[in-house]
């Protein structure tokens, strides 16, 4: 990536890291308003299976692993990217490495959920306070989950699907920060590990993933009022280990693995028409990216 200053634009979809033949250090940003991609400062260490989020206008890359010809190292790292300076800086590491992690943000705090370290599948969860640059463990999930989808709705943290080391999961659970406890919610209709999970219009969406046999293109959403999961239109491509984010009322899914190919495809879901459309291609195919959108 280039080390010059990034243009000061409004809302971009950032994609960090990923995997194609080895873990990647790319940071690229897509501007949906004009369809262009920006090549930005590389991660200091390549990583895949990471998660991305934005707090206070800064992009954070959390966990993952560096799978390279030199070896394979799960990551406990938290790194912060400043779009104004186009620079990465390290923050305090998590208590344990977490590959195929899920993250969510509540009240400016980053929650790191599940993930794996070697063959250990975590149920542990920890919270990062940017002002103090500190991590603290919170209540563990009821289930060990890697490849877990995480989303925040109404200041509640949802952990959806994943893999517990033995089974891919359709179960989901919800964390209540005030009580510091997890409770199971209605299970999805479909087993999904490595799905893309996000929130749009008071619903939690779970897109794609892997059911233990095949990659999926199906998509379902959870209505917190009715506590039910309902299928919506499927994506055009089957994909697991995909990136997902929401931009201006639409869901974007980026890359992933379809069981044969590392996808460069980016699809966009319009909830008004219940349709998916191909909107762009990433500069190269990859899975296991961390994705987030900058704030206004």
């Amino acid at each position: 990536g280039s080390m010059g200053h990034a243009p000061k634009v409004g809302r971009l979809i950032y994609t960090a890291g990923g995997y194609f033949r080895q873990s990647l250090s790319y940071l690229e940003a897509y501007n949906p308003s004009d369809g262009t991609w920006l090549d930005l400062a590389d991660l200091q260490v390549p990583r895949s299976g990471l998660a991305g989020c934005v707090v206070g206008g800064l992009l954070y890359a959390v966990g993952g692993r560096n799978n390279s010809p030199d070896g394979n190292t799960d990551s406990s790292a938290l790194d912060c990217y400043n779009p104004m300076t186009n620079q990465w800086s390290p923050c305090a590491p998590m208590s344990v490495p977490r590959n195929r992690i899920g993250v969510g943000v509540i009240d400016g705090h980053i929650y790191a959920v599940g993930g794996s370290h070697g063959c250990i599948h975590h149920n542990s969860v920890e919270r990062y306070e940017p002002e103090r640059d500190e991590w603290h463990l919170v209540a563990p999930m009821l289930t060990r989950r890697i490849g877990v989808g995480v989303a925040v709705l109404n200041r509640l943290l949802y952990a959806v699907g994943g893999f517990d080391g033995t089974n891919r999961l359709n179960s989901a659970e919800c964390y209540y920060p005030e009580r510091n406890e997890w409770r199971m919610i209605t299970a999805m209709n479909t087993i999904r590990s490595g799905a893309g999970v996000c929130v749009l219009h008071n619903c939690i969406y779970a897109a794609g993933g892997y059911d233990g046999q095949d990659q999926l293109n199906s998509v379902e959403r959870y209505d917190v009022e009715t506590e039910t999961w309902t299928f919506v239109a499927p994506m055009k491509h089957r994909r697991s280990a995909l990136g997902i984010t929401v931009h201006q009322g639409r869901i974007y899914v980026l890359g992933g693995y379809d069981g044969h190919t590392f996808l460069d495809s980016v699809e966009c879901y319009d909830p008004d028409t219940d349709t998916w459309s191909e909107v762009t291609r990433m500069t190269s195919g990859r899975s296991g990216v961390g994705v987030a959108v900058t704030m206004e």
Epitope: Y19, R21, C119, G147, F163, T166, G194, Q213, D214, Y257
Partner: antibody
Framework: EVQLVESGGGLVQPGGSLRLSCAAS????????IHWVRQAPGKGLEWVAS????????LYAKSVAGRFTISADTSKNTAYLQMNSLRAEDTAVYYC?????????????AGQGTLVTVSS | DIQMTQSPSSLSASVGDRVTITCRAS??????VAWYQQKPGKAPKLLIY???SLYSGVPSRFSGSRSGTDFTLTISSLQPEDFATYYC?????????FGQGTKVEIK
């Protein structure tokens, strides 16, 4: 019946290439992690490479990293090991194996192997 | 890399004997250890996974146990078909590594 059948072995000169195939039947390779393990003549077992069915990520032993490539074609239910820049020390019987979560990623099924001989 | 030190490298035993083979990991591998049996010219066959779980179809005379970083394969009453080479394997961390093997021969 679960079966794995390796093919593609043979005699090759140092610096040469071979592509091994592992045809699976009785199960879908899309549902398992596929590994290659080798055994030099009269020696023990050495793990070589693996591919994850969910993420597509591959792992390699340091001894082969950068020279070997594991891949899978789920439509043919076949895994492959592309071996480039072969060395005398790569001479071995190569086994493909199925590893599943149900058996804690131990190799619960393997083929009969294919012999690769690297010699001038 | 984690080393799996297997002992003995060979042993002689008679049918009906109780046989014990040990693997010591150079660092913690939790219970992520498997045991295999291999006969000449054949592929390895899984006997035990997760240190002590008997794989489907494997006779109950085979058992596995763990004590810290020490792992043991026991054959309670050796049968003629058990004369073979046995390997342990750790899959706790990358790269997966095998013990050097133990050849069980007829006394």
């Amino acid at each position: 019946e679960v079966q794995l059948v390796e093919s593609g072995g043979g005699l090759v000169q140092p610096g040469g290439s071979l592509r091994l195939s592992c045809a699976a039947s009785g199960f879908a390779i899309s549902a398992s992690s596929i590994h290659w393990v080798r055994q030099a003549p009269g020696k023990g077992l050495e793990w070589v490479a693996s591919i994850d069915p969910e993420t597509g990520e591959t792992l390699y032993a340091k001894s082969v990293a950068g020279r070997f490539t594991i891949s899978a074609d789920t439509s043919k239910n076949t895994a492959y090991l592309q071996m480039n820049s072969l060395r005398a020390e790569d001479t071995a019987v190569y086994y493909c194996a199925r590893c599943r979560a149900a058996s804690a990623y131990a190799a619960d099924a393997a083929g009969q192997g294919t012999l690769v001989t690297v010699s001038s | 890399d984690i080393q799996m030190t297997q002992s003995p490298s060979s042993l002689s035993a008679s049918v009906g004997d109780r046989v014990t083979i040990t693997c010591r990991a150079s660092q913690s591998v939790s219970s992520a250890v498997a045991w295999y049996q291999q006969k000449p010219g054949k592929a390895p066959k899984l006997l035990i996974y997760s240190a002590s779980s008997l794989y489907s179809g494997v006779p109950s005379r085979f058992s596995g146990s763990r004590s810290g970083t020490d792992f043991t394969l026991t054959i309670s009453s050796l049968q003629p078909e058990d004369f073979a080479t046995y390997y342990c394997q750790q899959s706790y961390s990358f790269p997966s590594t095998f013990g050097q093997g133990t050849k069980v021969e007829i006394k």
